[in-house]
């Protein structure tokens, strides 16, 4: 079943390579477990960045070696990518699956645009 | 802390009916999901299926479907687990569950060991 | 249904050993998969959610890890108190499916 989502259209990431976006689900059920599913596309190829599920009030859980974090409130998920290079500007989508009671449910957002931007290195000081 | 109480075992006769009972206690009992797994040594372990306490939604194994009823209790804490035309096969261990994240059961009961036998 | 599959039914090591039990998916599971300890006096215990997330209470010793169809749970150091029955259970689609245990001994 089809479920909208929401998502900004533009992010720029920080001087660190971070870059934070919030993702909104309209639940059509009584969603008690959500996975979060953040993609990257890039050349027409999509990829899975990293993904993580949750209990509704509680944190969410990113396997061990995801370049994600996130916290949820609500219908909200506010997602932080880290580690991000100029060659990791891209379209990353986020796709929302209420996982549990059944009936499931999966939306995709139309996905934000992440422009990243590599910090010019410091001069030499001598 | 979290507990989950059940009679330790259960006698009964071919072609009745038996229900087996789980206290909770320890924690909010409408906030979580509670489950009904059964336990036999060649069988292993099956699902047999959910109840949330908050309104009484179930799900079933279809294998289960015509044999299993689960109803809750609130004002008690206490999740029931009816089995009925019971025959040799229903023989088992069963364990509720309690439902946590990604479909994992963070606290189990004891069991309560059912034996069908005339 | 989901079937899964532990190869292994009964593993034996020695105290101190690093120990691997295997579990695997008839589909995948994308990662929702958990490990429980089941003692010989029928106590069950959940170890790891979600693959490789260790539950509260849990001794550091054990890990998990997987992807797709193929998990794995790690015990490092074992101990006298790990001898065990270890299940798996895919919790990705209903019904919901248990491997059939694997069966830990001391040598």
């Known amino acids: 079943k089809a479920m909208h989502v929401a998502q900004p259209a533009v992010v720029l990431a920080n001087s660190r390579g971070t870059a934070s976006f919030v993702c909104e689900y309209a639940s059509p059920g009584k969603a008690t477990e959500v996975r979060v599913t953040v993609l990257r596309q890039a050349d027409s190829q999509v990829t899975e960045v990293c993904a993580a599920t949750y209990m509704m009030g509680n944190e969410l859980t990113f396997l061990d070696d995801s370049i994600c974090t996130g916290t949820s409130s609500g219908n909200q998920v506010n997602l932080t990518i880290q580690g991000l290079r100029a060659m990791d500007t891209g379209l990353y989508i986020c796709k929302v699956e209420l996982m549990y009671p059944p009936p499931y449910y999966m939306g995709i957002g139309n996905g934000t645009q992440i422009y990243v931007i590599d910090p010019e290195p410091c001069p030499d000081s001598d | 802390q979290v507990q989950l109480q059940q009679p330790g075992a259960e006698l009964v006769r071919p072609g009745s009916s038996v229900k087996l009972s789980c206290k909770a206690s320890?924690?909010?009992?409408?906030?979580?999901?509670m489950h009904w797994v059964k336990q036999r040594p060649i069988q292993g372990l099956e699902w047999i299926g959910n109840?949330?306490?908050?309104?009484?939604?179930?799900h079933y194994n279809q294998n289960f479907k015509d044999k299993a009823t689960l109803t809750v209790d609130k004002s008690s804490s206490t999740a029931y687990l009816q089995l009925s035309s019971l025959t040799s096969e229903d023989s088992a261990v069963y364990y509720c569950?309690?439902?946590?994240?990604?479909?994992?059961?963070?606290?189990w009961g004891q069991g309560t060991t059912l034996t069908v036998s005339s | 249904d989901i079937q899964m599959t532990q190869t292994t039914s009964s593993l034996s090591a020695s105290l101190g050993d690093r120990v691997t039990v295997s579990c695997r998916a008839s589909?995948?599971?994308?990662?929702?998969l958990n490990w429980y300890q089941q003692k010989p006096d029928g106590t069950v215990k959940l170890l790891i959610y979600?693959?490789?997330k260790l539950h509260s209470g849990v001794p550091s010793r054990f890990s998990g890890s997987g992807s797709g169809t193929d998990y794995f749970l790690a015990i490092s150091n074992l101990e006298q108190e790990d001898i065990a029955t270890y299940f798996c259970?895919?919790?990705?689609?209903?019904?919901?499916?248990f491997g059939g245990g694997t069966k830990l001994e001391i040598k």
């Open positions: 109840i949330d306490p908050s309104d009484s939604e179930t």
């Open positions: 979600f693959t490789s």
């Open positions: 320890g924690y909010t009992f409408t906030s979580y999901w």
């Open positions: 259970q895919q919790g990705n689609t209903l019904p919901y499916t």
């Open positions: 569950a309690r439902r946590y994240t990604s479909s994992s059961f963070d606290y």
């Open positions: 589909q995948d599971i994308r990662n929702y």
